[in-house]
């Protein structure tokens, strides 16, 4: 199957955007559907026959001249300038700014909290299953299985630190070697990048915003996947990570350190612990084949317990089971021995919502999953709206320039490395790469940060999360110190190696190009984003897991042909774009393949059929809510439904619709104001700081 859909004529043109994305398109005009409309202008448009409004297919072919969709949008300021305001206006504006800041921080707080709850929800739903993945004995001999287990477990528990700590405890208790643990750590690195990809999905409402957000999120995925693609075979062949980290661990006489400082957790924990508290030891116990743990609930019930160590007499099947011959006796019928037991006395119950419900983990997990996703989505929308109203005019210009501008020549190259350090520092502060990259995603979406700048920040985030792990390792108890430190260092050097591969030389920054390609496809076919998520984080790892269980022969038998086909397609694609004359006429483009193998259009039709009915219902519901809301606030245009719903309404009223390019499917106030869609009366409430 062709890796890039809709590759009609292979032109040696690297700037050609794939899958009909809103980019520079082949300049051939298209039958009667041409329009002069460019982004954010109200030029006349040719009216066309209306496509089903719930279809995700592009409504028209792109205009001949369209701006690069990756250029940051100009966030226009419609407010009255600061200098033109009277004292009352300035005071009002000042308090409005303070109010917005408070709101922004509030939503940001609940956004981070919802990420924490989301992680807990995933652990409740899939934590035990994740633990059981680890109890597979084939991990020791099969690095590929270790890799996919790392991915699956981290995706299931939504926390690389949880999966890493399980690995550490397994290495400490000799259930796993460091060599076998390295691929799992690599997999955990991949798995952790799903969180910000999920966050990006929340911005699906606006095509251009979604394009940027999704590309910004998946740049992390591609970096991790590509790093593993290169470094796992290198590690299997040379064991360089194992050797380097072993030398470091052996050359230093480490003393147990302090715990890594919990900076963000200090603020979020008081809230999240009121929602749910988990006993994360259960997952580790399952991973270590503890049968009793399988029946334990992950929901923590008792928070205050008293542990007492005592010696008790216990019966044993035979004298062979005695702790020692001298501590063995009989009562005439049964054999007895003395055992040191630790018994836990429950003193005080935890204070969270689910403490007295006694619901199964799956039920609690499902409830929390739905609620946390709703809160996450709501907070994200509000953050984007607030940022949208704040970051306008000169404010936006200053911020964008500060973040996205390079140092002056000849130090321009240093900017990216500073961004890596900033990313690492910020991640160290918030103690979670997921939180940092998830917070970055909406900023990329609304156009505050470019993908080129987000890339080093994300790489830095990868480093930051490993420094946290190193600190945590140094705080480990004696027996776990060596193994946890070595694993944390493996994680660190893996990310350093990845950065060396995919960052220093601009030509090698493949993740950016791949993410942009995926962003383009996903902006046009939004269902493809979900498809990508399922394929890369669930289906591929599960398939490899299944094949690995079947044995090496099966894995190689299926894997080698698949890898061969992928390499063949990539080589062909490279030749088509670089030197097509080398190829026979038939292979110079993908037209020899059936349409469904080279384009997403046929698939889009299938998906549209499935989602159409649901979307109709959803929009009806949306319309009712919108009308109720508008009645309440007594303004007819204050609340607008999504583009899909507007189209539906207009289609039902039998009107002809002027079709806009994907870029104009905006839903943020700024764009509406810029296009004169929002009444002028609304703009007087807007104010800019400068």
């Amino acid at each position: 199957m062709a890796p890039w859909p809709e590759l009609g004529d292979a032109q040696p043109n690297p700037d050609k955007y794939l899958e009909g994305a809103a980019g520079q398109q082949p300049t051939a005009p298209d039958k009667s559907k041409e329009t002069n409309k460019t982004d954010n202008t109200e030029a006349p448009v040719t009216k066309i026959e209306l496509l089903p409004s719930y279809s995700t297919a592009t409504l028209i072919d792109e205009p001949t001249e369209v701006d690069d969709p990756w250029n940051l949008p100009t966030l226009q300021d419609s407010g009255i300038k600061w200098s033109e305001r009277d004292t009352k206006g300035k005071i009002l504006c000042f308090f409005q700014g303070i109010g917005r800041l408070i709101l922004l921080l509030g939503f940001l707080y609940f956004f981070v909290c919802s990420l924490d709850i989301l992680s807990s929800a995933f652990q409740l739903v899939g934590g035990k299953m994740a633990g059981q993945f680890f109890s597979n004995s084939s991990i020791m001999s099969n690095p590929l299985l270790g890799l996919v287990i790392g991915v699956l477990v981290t995706v299931l528990v939504q926390s690389s630190s949880t999966s890493t700590s399980i690995v550490v405890s397994m290495v400490s208790s000799s259930l796993l070697t460091v060599r076998a643990a390295i691929p799992i750590i690599m997999g955990a690195n991949i798995g952790t990048s799903i969180t910000n990809t999920i966050v990006a999905l929340m911005q699906v409402g606006d095509r251009s915003e979604f394009r940027r957000a999704f590309a910004g999120a998946t740049v992390h995925d591609f970096f991790n996947w590509l790093s593993v693609l290169v470094l796992l075979p290198v590690e299997v062949a040379t064991h360089y990570l194992e050797i380097i980290t072993q030398l470091i661990v052996e050359s230093f006489h480490f003393k147990n350190g302090e715990d890594a400082p919990d900076l963000l957790k200090v603020i979020t924990k008081p809230f999240t612990k009121l929602i749910v508290q988990l006993d994360k030891k259960v997952i580790s116990q399952i991973a270590m084949n503890d049968e009793k743990a399988k029946n334990k609930s992950l929901v923590k019930i008792w928070c205050k317990t008293f542990t007492n160590k005592t010696q008790i007499n216990v019966t044993v099947p035979s004298t062979a089971n005695c702790t020692s011959p001298s501590l063995c006796w009989t009562d005439g019928i049964q054999n007895w021995t003395m055992k040191n037991v630790t018994y836990k006395e429950n003193i005080a119950k935890c204070q969270h919502i689910f403490v007295n419900f006694h619901l199964p983990d799956l039920a609690v997990g499902t409830i929390l999953l739905i609620l946390s996703l709703l809160v996450l989505c709501g907070c994200l929308i509000m953050i984007v709206k607030i940022l949208g109203s704040v970051l306008k005019g000169q404010v936006a210009t200053v911020i964008k320039k500060t973040i996205n501008t390079d140092f002056p020549f000849p130090f321009a190259w240093l900017t990216g490395y500073l961004a890596i350090l900033v990313g690492a520092g910020m991640t160290f502060i918030v103690q979670s790469s997921s939180v940092f990259t998830s917070a970055l995603t909406p900023l990329i979406g609304i156009g505050v940060i470019t993908i080129e700048r987000a890339y080093p920040l994300t790489l830095g985030s990868n480093i930051g999360t490993t420094t946290t792990a190193i600190l945590a390792a140094l705080a480990s108890p004696g027996n776990a110190l060596r193994s946890s430190l070595q694993i944390a260092l493996c994680h660190f050097f893996f990310n350093i190696s990845g950065i060396l591969l995919w960052y220093p030389i601009p030509f090698t920054r493949l993740p950016i190009r791949m993410a942009k390609g995926l962003g383009n496809i996903s902006a046009k076919y939004r269902w493809f984003a979900v498809f990508y998520l399922i394929i890369f984080f669930f289906l591929i790892p599960l398939t490899v897991f299944g094949l690995s269980l079947a044995g090496w022969r099966v894995l190689v038998g299926v894997g080698v042909p698949v890898v061969f086909i992928i390499i063949l397609v990539l080589c062909l694609r490279l030749l088509q774009s670089r030197c097509p004359r080398v190829l026979p006429k038939k292979l110079q483009n993908w037209n020899f393949l059936p349409l469904w193998m080279r384009s997403l259009k046929p698939w889009d039709a299938v998906v549209s059929k499935f989602t159409g009915c649901f979307q109709m219902r959803c929009c009806c519901c949306c319309r009712v809510c919108c009308r109720a809301c508008c009645l309440l606030c007594d303004c007819p245009k204050c609340c607008r439904c999504s583009k899909c719903c507007e189209d539906l309404e207009e289609a039902q009223e039998g009107q002809d619709v002027p079709v806009k390019a994907p870029e104009t499917f905006d839903n943020i106030t700024i764009s509406r104001e810029a296009q004169g869609e929002v009444p002028a009366s609304d703009s007087k409430t807007e104010c800019t700081a400068l």
Partner: antibody, heavy 119, light 107 residues
Framework: QVQLQQPGAELVKPGASVKMSCKTS????????MHWVKQTPGQGLEWIGA????????AYNQKFKGKATLTADKSSSTAYMQLSSLTSEASAVYYC????????????WGQGTSVIVSS | DIVMTQSHKFMSRSVGDRVRITCKAS??????VAWYQQKPGQSPKLLIY???TRHSGVPDRFTGSGSGTDFIFTISNVQSEDLADYFC?????????FGAGTKLELK
């Protein structure tokens, strides 16, 4: 207080069987093991076996397996020992003794039943 | 079976004397040893268990010591009512076994 009552003496013919009783009072019969011990002037004290009345579980000294059968009646809090195919060597004093919970020391003993095997 | 050996069959002491009765196990029994007193015409009575622990109501002149294979039972201030047979018993493993007994007599 804890009491274990045994009949004073049993006179039996060789080859016959005897079932001696040990009626308990003053404690919960089902919580402690009941041991049976044989005492002869020549052999000293010999452990025959024990029964746990709670479950009816028994353990025997290999020497007395097949010779002695231990039973317990929870309703009357009485332990029984049946000795079969008696010979003159079975003539002795048989004690029932309560085992201390969790180990094999015997804290309370019956007065003993003197068994005389004689034709 | 574990054999419990009481080296002295008889011991003769005056009132107020100190008497030490020894018991040797054929293998390590830890501290799973009990001592009994049996007066003529009576049933045995538990004095010591776990080699050193006095049973309730037993006077403190009776003490036990030892672990592993060698055990000692001591009466520190012999009284006339202490004239009896003294048995050791192991309960380290089945079958439970007793020593042959040591008879304490008055001089």
């Amino acid at each position: 207080q804890v009491q274990l009552q045994q009949p004073g003496a049993e006179l039996v013919k060789p080859g016959a069987s005897v079932k001696m009783s040990c009626k308990t009072s003053g404690y919960t019969f089902t919580t402690n093991n009941m041991h049976w011990v044989k005492q002869t002037p020549g052999q000293g004290l010999e452990w025959i076996g024990a029964i746990y009345p709670g479950s009816g579980a028994t353990a025997y000294n290999q020497k007395f397996k097949g010779k002695a059968t231990l039973t317990a009646d929870k309703s009357s809090s009485t332990a029984y020992m049946q000795l079969s195919s008696l010979t003159s060597e079975a003539s002795a004093v048989y004690y029932c003794a309560r085992g201390m919970y969790g180990h094999g020391a015997m804290d309370y003993w019956g007065q003993g039943t003197s068994v005389i095997v004689s034709s | 079976d574990i054999v419990m050996t009481q080296s002295h069959k008889f011991m003769s002491r005056s009132v107020g004397d100190r008497v030490r009765i020894t018991c040797k196990a054929s293998q390590d029994v830890g501290t799973a040893v009990a001592w009994y007193q049996q007066k003529p015409g009576q049933s045995p009575k538990l004095l010591i268990y776990w080699a050193t622990t006095r049973h309730s109501g037993v006077p403190d002149r009776f003490t036990g010591s030892g672990s592993g294979t060698d055990f000692i039972f001591t009466i520190s201030n012999v009284q006339s009512e202490d004239l009896a047979d003294y048995f050791c018993q192991q309960y380290s493993s089945n079958p439970l076994t007793f020593g042959a007994g040591t008879k304490l007599e008055l001089k």
